[in-house]
C-alpha cells in the first residue's frame, strides 16, 4: 500500500534571466527512494539515481544543475521555461510517486516565490 505523499513548491514564479530551485519531498513512507526523474511536460530533464548519481540530459546541461539534494536548479530562465514540471520518485517497495510544480517565468520584477527556494 502506498502511504507516502509528495510535497512540492507548488506554483512558483521567477524572473526571466534568473534562477529557480525545483524541490519535491517525499514523506509519510519508509520506502527507499531508488531514483528521481525530473520532467518538463514530455521532456526528460534530469535523473538522480541512488547508485549512479545525477544524469542531466545533454540538451539541458548548460541551464540545469543538480540539487540541492534531490531538487533541480534551473538557470538563465526564459519565458519558454514556463510550464509544468514533474518530480517522479521511484521507490521500493511502494512504486512511483509523482509531484507537480507549475513555473511561470515573468518578464519583469513582479515575480514572487518563497525565499527558501530562490537563489540569491
Amino acid at each position: 500500500m502506498m502511504t507516502g505523499t509528495i510535497e512540492t513548491t507548488g506554483n512558483i514564479s521567477a524572473e526571466k534571466g534568473g534562477s529557480i530551485i525545483l524541490q519535491c519531498h517525499l514523506s509519510s513512507t519508509t520506502a527507499q527512494v531508488t531514483q528521481v526523474n525530473w520532467e518538463q511536460q514530455d521532456q526528460l530533464l534530469a535523473i538522480c539515481n541512488a547508485d549512479l548519481g545525477w544524469h542531466i540530459s545533454p540538451s539541458f546541461k548548460d541551464r540545469v544543475a543538480p540539487g540541492p539534494g534531490l531538487g533541480l536548479t534551473l538557470q538563465s530562465l526564459t519565458v519558454n521555461d514556463t510550464g509544468e514540471y514533474f518530480c517522479i520518485y521511484h521507490t521500493y517497495p511502494d512504486g512511483t510517486y509523482t509531484g507537480r510544480i507549475f513555473l511561470e517565468v515573468l518578464e519583469s520584477s513582479v515575480a514572487e516565490h518563497g525565499a527558501r527556494f530562490q537563489i540569491p
Epitope: T34, Q35, E39, D42, Q43, L44, I47, N49, D51, L52, H55, S57, S59, H90, Y92, P93
Partner: antibody, heavy 118, light 107 residues
C-alpha cells in the same frame, strides 16, 4: 572498457533447460540494472527480463514468465538467466545488456545462441 | 503492453541522402524512447536515448526528436557505414518493447 560476455548457449531439446551467464567487467556491476534481450533468427529484438541493481525489482516478458528466472551475483559480477521448459520459439541469440538509470541500453554483450530443437 | 510501430520497414537510399525513420507508440511514453543501430551478426548499438540525447561517441549526423507518441530518427547525410537496421524502443514501462525495425539499404 565495459565488457559483457555471455555463455551457456547451445542446442537443447524442447522441454529442456539451460542456464545463461553474463560476465561483466570494466564497470561497477552492482550499480546497474541488467537486462536480457533476445533476437530470433532473421527477426527483431524482444525484451526478455530485467533485474535492478540489488535484485529487489525483477520483471519478465509474458512469453517467458514462469519458465525463466533472472538473477545476479554482484560479488561475482555475473548475471544469469535460468531457462526451463524451453520451446522451439525460444530459439534466438540472447544478449545481456547494461541499463543505466533503468531507461536505455548503453552496452550489449556479443550474444549467445540458444537453439531449441529435437 | 505499449506497441511500437516503426516505418518504413525498409528503405533504399544513397550516400549523402537525408534519411528519416519514424516510430509511433500506442500510448504516450513522454520522452522515454531510444534508438539503436544493428549490423548483421553484431549486437545493437545505442544511438539516441531519451528521444533526443546523442549517445557519447555517436556521430552528430544522427539526431532524434519527438515526445508523447510520435518520434523521429534522422540521419542528415547517410554514410556507407550507416547501412544497417534501426530499432526504436520504449522504456516508459515494462514490458519494454521494440519497434519492428527499419532496414536501410544501398540504392
Amino acid at each position: 572498457e565495459v565488457q559483457l560476455l555471455e555463455s551457456g548457449g547451445g542446442l537443447v531439446q524442447p522441454g529442456g533447460s539451460l542456464r545463461l551467464s553474463c560476465a561483466a567487467s570494466g564497470f561497477t556491476f552492482s550499480s546497474y540494472s541488467m537486462h536480457w534481450v533476445r533476437q530470433a533468427p532473421g527477426k527483431g529484438l524482444e525484451w526478455v527480463s530485467s533485474i535492478n541493481s540489488n535484485a529487489g525489482t525483477i520483471s519478465y516478458a509474458d512469453s517467458v514468465k514462469g519458465r525463466f528466472t533472472i538473477s545476479r551475483d554482484n560479488s561475482k559480477n555475473t548475471l544469469y538467466l535460468q531457462m526451463n521448459s524451453l520451446r522451439a520459439e525460444d530459439t534466438a541469440v540472447y544478449y545481456c545488456a547494461r541499463v543505466p538509470y533503468d531507461y536505455w541500453i548503453d552496452y550489449w554483450g556479443q550474444g549467445t545462441l540458444v537453439t531449441v530443437s529435437s | 503492453d505499449i506497441q511500437m510501430t516503426q516505418s518504413p520497414s525498409s528503405l533504399s537510399a544513397s550516400v549523402g541522402d537525408r534519411v528519416t525513420i519514424t516510430c509511433r507508440a500506442s500510448q504516450s511514453i513522454s520522452s522515454y524512447l531510444n534508438w539503436y543501430q544493428q549490423k548483421p551478426g553484431k549486437a545493437p548499438k545505442l544511438l539516441i536515448y531519451a528521444a533526443s540525447s546523442l549517445q557519447s561517441g555517436v556521430p552528430s549526423r544522427f539526431s532524434g526528436s519527438g515526445s508523447g507518441t510520435d518520434f523521429t530518427l534522422t540521419i542528415s547525410s547517410l554514410q556507407p557505414e550507416d547501412f544497417a537496421t534501426y530499432y526504436c524502443q520504449q522504456s516508459y514501462s515494462t514490458p519494454l518493447t521494440f519497434g519492428g525495425g527499419t532496414k536501410v539499404e544501398i540504392k
